[in-house]
Interface confidence: low
Amino acid sequence: DAHKSEVAHRFKDLGEENFKALVLIAFAQYLQQCPFEDHVKLVNEVTEFAKTCVADESAENCDKSLHTLFGDKLCTVATLRETYGEMADCCAKQEPERNECFLQHKDDNPNLPRLVRPEVDVMCTAFHDNEETFLKKYLYEIARRHPYFYAPELLFFAKRYKAAFTECCQAADKAACLLPKLDELRDEGKASSAKQRLKCASLQKFGERAFKAWAVARLSQRFPKAEFAEVSKLVTDLTKVHTECCHGDLLECADDRADLAKYICENQDSISSKLKECCEKPLLEKSHCIAEVENDEMPADLPSLAADFVESKDVCKNYAEAKDVFLGMFLYEYARRHPDYSVVLLLRLAKTYETTLEKCCAAADPHECYAKVFDEFKPLVEEPQNLIKQNCELFEQLGEYKFQNALLVRYTKKVPQVSTPTLVEVSRNLGKVGSKCCKHPEAKRMPCAEDYLSVVLNQLCVLHEKTPVSDRVTKCCTESLVNRRPCFSALEVDETYVPKEFNAETFTFHADICTLSEKERQIKKQTALVELVKHKPKATKEQLKAVMDDFAAFVEKCCKADDKETCFAEEGKKLVAASQAALGL
């Protein structure tokens, strides 16, 4: 439905508060280095303009597209060339090329200072002094660090952030009330950002068909009682929402997401019996709840898949007449029967089925050719099952920190060219799969673990894409979205790698390590571990364990010493010498 003024349409649909918040997010995700005050000024100008269009849709410039309006506004930033370099060249382009240009310059790892959390009293004072600015600052800081954060979901996080301060700043023990809530929001926020980053990578690198296939599988698992036509409609709508958000069209995205939540709740009888509670919530909570809702129970009497997809004489006819619909139905039918499989496994099975039909439907006897197609699924199913079993056993044996260390060593040996901070970040996240998924019963382990690993490996892929250093990473990241994890799993030690020169400075530590949080201290030790492996890729597990145990003892000893700095200097030299001897550096 055409509107005379798109900006007026979205302003009216979303309301002023959400409109302003979404424009701020959009601007901060594009111009990640701009100061907060500059963004607020731009947002206020856009909002005032939108209000004039609401009053009179025929007013000057009100008929312009949102990309044109927002792009023109971003291109008024005076320091664009100095701050962003070649991104300023985007402003010489016309829409839609200008927006595409801005999108290409989004930085997954912007050079921004780490967010340091002030004292609770300082935060509460700032919150009470100017609540609106305080909350805008939250949106700005998250959006600029996470340029693909799912904007309507960020509004939900901001609502929870506000609620935490409203409640805790009047509590007797503010810190005890607030800090756990902020930790939870931070951890959930990082997870949400990473999940959305995979959706955008899927759309942008592998296309709409890949995203739709993912959505068919996931929604069919979640809503197994819904019929195929229903799932198809939801997939179409969900694809539109995510395409818009990943493309920077945040107002349209938020508006369409609200419409989708409304549709789902109006039709929940046809979709899932698990939606009732979600649908009683206010909009932002409702959309979040629907996105996280548990899988509905599978219908009791689902017939065997073989009848329609292997035994039927019409398989090739049906496939030829509507390939994607037929494959979509296969994926839907398989996924609704298998909530115990990961989405990526289901997509591998569908790809195997498609490849088999492509080959067999051109054969002399198609039925004989594809009759055993389901047998080809067995090894594909067993591979992740075995891998998860082995890794959960290792996790239970080692605990999270040492399990992360095992993965750090494993991945550094596979792709030693990758930067140390990236290897530490990615391996730490890979290691979290243990505490996240191994506690689940067998039936929930694979969807938890393998789909989580897809999200984490995508982080490696997007960080590596910015500064490519390893052909092996590029290959695993680009060849097949659903086979990324098996591709990385299959990598052996990189025999072509020339070990890094030994640098004593890398292994020099100071007393400041003693005041770090446990997490920060772990990261320091894990950074040293990666560097060790880069120096000595052939080091055995036992050698590395011995060095790391010595290192932990050294840190503990010096942090208890009266003269910590002297201890770190003297004992550090001894440790480096002993480690060199142990590893033959």
């Epitope: 219908p299 329609d308 509507a322």
Partner: nanobody, 115 residues
Framework: EVQLVESGGGLVQPGGSLRLSCAAS????????MSWVRQAPGKGPEWVSA????????RYAESVKGRFTISRDNAKKTLYLQMNSLKPEDTAVYYC????????RNQGTQVTVAS
């Protein structure tokens, strides 16, 4: 977009007949088995009848066997349900589905059997 639109319902006396139609669009109708499902007031959905993609194989719930006939015209992308000897307990919203699911998304068509 996949769409299914039912029509042909109405008020009929016990023993009467009705013919329901379901017009399909947005997918290759001739490639898929189809079903009719019904939902009586205050009850869950009940599968009524199914037909394979070619129209050769038809199945019926015990409660309608011998009274209802499912058919299809792939050229017209339409599914039919001929209902004879209707009873008050056949009163329900009838809707068509792809495959053999009992979940509804489309509006359906109301059939009321009453004297």
């Amino acid at each position: 977009e996949v769409q299914l639109v039912e029509s042909g319902g109405g008020l009929v006396q016990p023993g009467g007949s009705l013919r329901l139609s379901c017009a399909a669009s947005g997918f290759t109708f001739g490639s898929f088995g189809m079903s009719w499902v019904r939902q009586a007031p205050g009850k869950g959905p009940e599968w009524v009848s199914a037909i394979d993609s070619s129209g050769a194989d038809t199945r019926y719930a015990e409660s309608v066997k011998g009274r209802f006939t499912i058919s299809r015209d792939n050229a017209k992308k339409t599914l039919y349900l001929q209902m004879n000897s209707l009873k008050p307990e056949d009163t329900a919203v009838y809707y068509c589905t792809i495959g053999r699911s009992t979940s509804r998304r489309n509006q359906g068509t109301q059939v009321t059997v009453a004297s």
